[in-house]
Interface confidence: low
Amino acid sequence: KLTIESTPFNVAEGKEVLLLVHNLPQHLFGYSWYKGERVDGNRQIIGYVIGTQQATPGPAYSGREIIYPNASLLIQNIIQNDTGFYTLHVIKSDLVNEEATGQFRVYPELPKPSISSNNSKPVEDKDAVAFTCEPETQDATYLWWVNNQSLPVSPRLQLSNGNRTLTLFNVTRNDTASYKCETQNPVSARRSDSVILNVLYGPDAPTISPLNTSYRSGENLNLSCHAASNPPAQYSWFVNGTFQQSTQELFIPNITVNNSGSYTCQAHNSDTGLNRTTVTTITVYAEPPKPFITSNNSNPVEDEDAVALTCEPEIQNTTYLWWVNNQSLPVSPRLQLSNDNRTLTLLSVTRNDVGPYECGIQNELSVDHSDPVILNVLYGPDDPTISPSYTYYRPGVNLSLSCHAASNPPAQYSWLIDGNIQQHTQELFISNITEKNSGLYTCQANNSASGHSRTTVKTITVSAELPKPSISSNNSKPVEDKDAVAFTCEPEAQNTTYLWWVNGQSLPVSPRLQLSNGNRTLTLFNVTRNDARAYVCGIQNSVSANRSDPVTLDVLYGPDTPIISPPDSSYLSGANLNLSCHSASNPSPQYSWRINGIPQQHTQVLFIAKITPNNNGTYACFVSNLATGRNNSIVKSITVSASGTSPGLSAGA
């Protein structure tokens, strides 16, 4: 069947369209195109005779049409009037006619649209805005874009006038956006330039910053005000209701208490005509003076004086605080605070009370600290120490003794030999000593401030021969498996070798034995009863040697588990029972007996004459060592059989 296809169907003005013929019959004479849906000679566009290949224009020919041998018709430079139906009339060789109709539509190329607005400066929450997409074009579709997105769903947005008009009711600041409109028809689409909606709003309630409301006298007050507003707000400041200035910031240097009050920021929008205010209350506090500490005694004497520290100045209704060594006050019966905390009293000062001490005045905002104060506690002198500790010297060496005593102020020192004053120095030096330099060497330390003096006496022996040494012990009665014992070989002598013997033998190798202090001290750790031996120390130098008398270590031990003898446990009725208890112990233990749990006698031997079966039972021996504080016991069962019964068998067997 003969058909016409329009390519394209929708044609833009100025473009071209091809009316393409399909299923054209064979053996044709010719064909003719007509404008409209029927063959009408008045509306013939063009005719074509195949035999002559001659095209003949008709009344409707415009000069823009071209006919092709295959009967297709090309129309160029299309105009709006070309819209409609076109009919092809085919004349076959047998002069039988055939017709087919096609159509196309012509649309204009759309111009770039623009947006008109009925209100260029709408006011928030008050005005509506109507945007209209220009120009009005027939057969065009209108679309809208907000920030390049399609329109959101909102009851405040309304499309009308065939979508050509977009109305925003009750505009808000959030409606400030980029708006575009778009026109579309089947042959073109065009978008407008952006229109930015300028919504007037505010001012909102202003915010005053910083949020600080409390200031100290002498600080700078710098307040800034901001309110959301379009156009930007104009600002005014009021203090206690009095106008100050029309600026966004308020600056007052070096404020005083008089600057306390209510500070109001007023924001004004000239376009909306609205005003909003915010009030902040500023409090300026007087800066209290820096506190300082006074003392009733600048040089207290240890263990004699009390010291009262007072925090100045005195201010009514003020809290006073104290610190010692950067810590809050320790709980101590020697520290007393007055009712108002302003005075801290140290009863009976010690050298450890030097401080530093700080007091603080608490004001409304913080705590002001005083400078630290250190107490000059006078103390001492303590007992002087003479060094070195040697007491024996060989002739010909130099004697150099030094004296020191803890003291504030530092002690003044004097040396005496055999009671005779020598010199007022801390050190005593005698070169090339002889036996005549032997004697009592006294160091005297004197504190001029407290008036106190202390002395220490040291015996110095100058001899070529070493003295007979002796052994001192730090524990005369050590307890086994508990105590350690340190033996020291006396005296301490210069350039001397110290040696030790146990039971006449040199020291055994043992982890429990340790030599120290130049071999002068022998320590026995965790003593045992086997350490109860004779200990001898010896000293020697290049010209002599000597040994101490032996010292026997008295190790306290026990009591060990006691043994009851004889070992028999079966007796015949009528025999005598004579039990003896023994336990290894130093010192000897105390003994006691119990029969069937009942206390008997405090003896080592238990004797019962002519026993009977009534004496059957448990016999317990208890031992106690009062020196070690330890106890022990053992239990023995005794069975007494009737006469004539074999021991160990029950009656009637």
């Epitope: 910083p210 949020l211 600080n212 409301t213 409390s214 200031y215 409090t283 506090y285 809290t319 605080l321 603080g360 608490q362 409304e364 905002l365 913080s366 705590v367 600290h369």
Partner: nanobody
């Protein structure tokens, strides 16, 4: 320059816990009082807790007593607010501020941290 920086806010379910921190610089917190102030839309500003480290004093708003604990670590110059058994009405922006002990007035403020209590 005095600065207070809060942290530790967030979203928590009712009954949950949060611990807010306030790091101070430019001054010693042992010499002043530090408070936690909260602001919620439509509610009055509320001082929920304050601590004066130099005298060991703490105080709490009735609405948080027994649930919130304020503390201070003077060695770290930091104050803390431990918030337990949180409720929806505790939702607010929490600010750390220096507090005048005798008056509920604030001198220096942090920028705030948001606490949201919601299931």
């Amino acid at each position: 320059e005095v600065q207070l920086v809060e942290s530790g806010g967030g979203l928590v379910q009712p009954g949950g816990s949060l611990r807010l921190s306030c790091a101070a610089s430019g001054f010693n917190i042992k010499d002043t009082c530090i408070g936690w102030v909260r602001r919620a839309p439509g509610k009055e500003e509320e001082l929920v807790a304050a601590i004066c480290p130099y005298i060991g004093e703490t105080r709490y708003a009735d609405s948080v007593k027994g649930r919130f604990t304020i503390s201070a670590d003077t060695s770290k110059n930091t104050a803390y607010l431990q918030m337990n058994s949180l409720r929806a009405e505790d939702t607010a922006v929490y600010y750390c501020a220096t507090v005048a002990r005798k008056y509920n007035q604030y001198n220096y403020w942090g920028q705030g941290t948001t606490v949201t209590v919601s299931s």
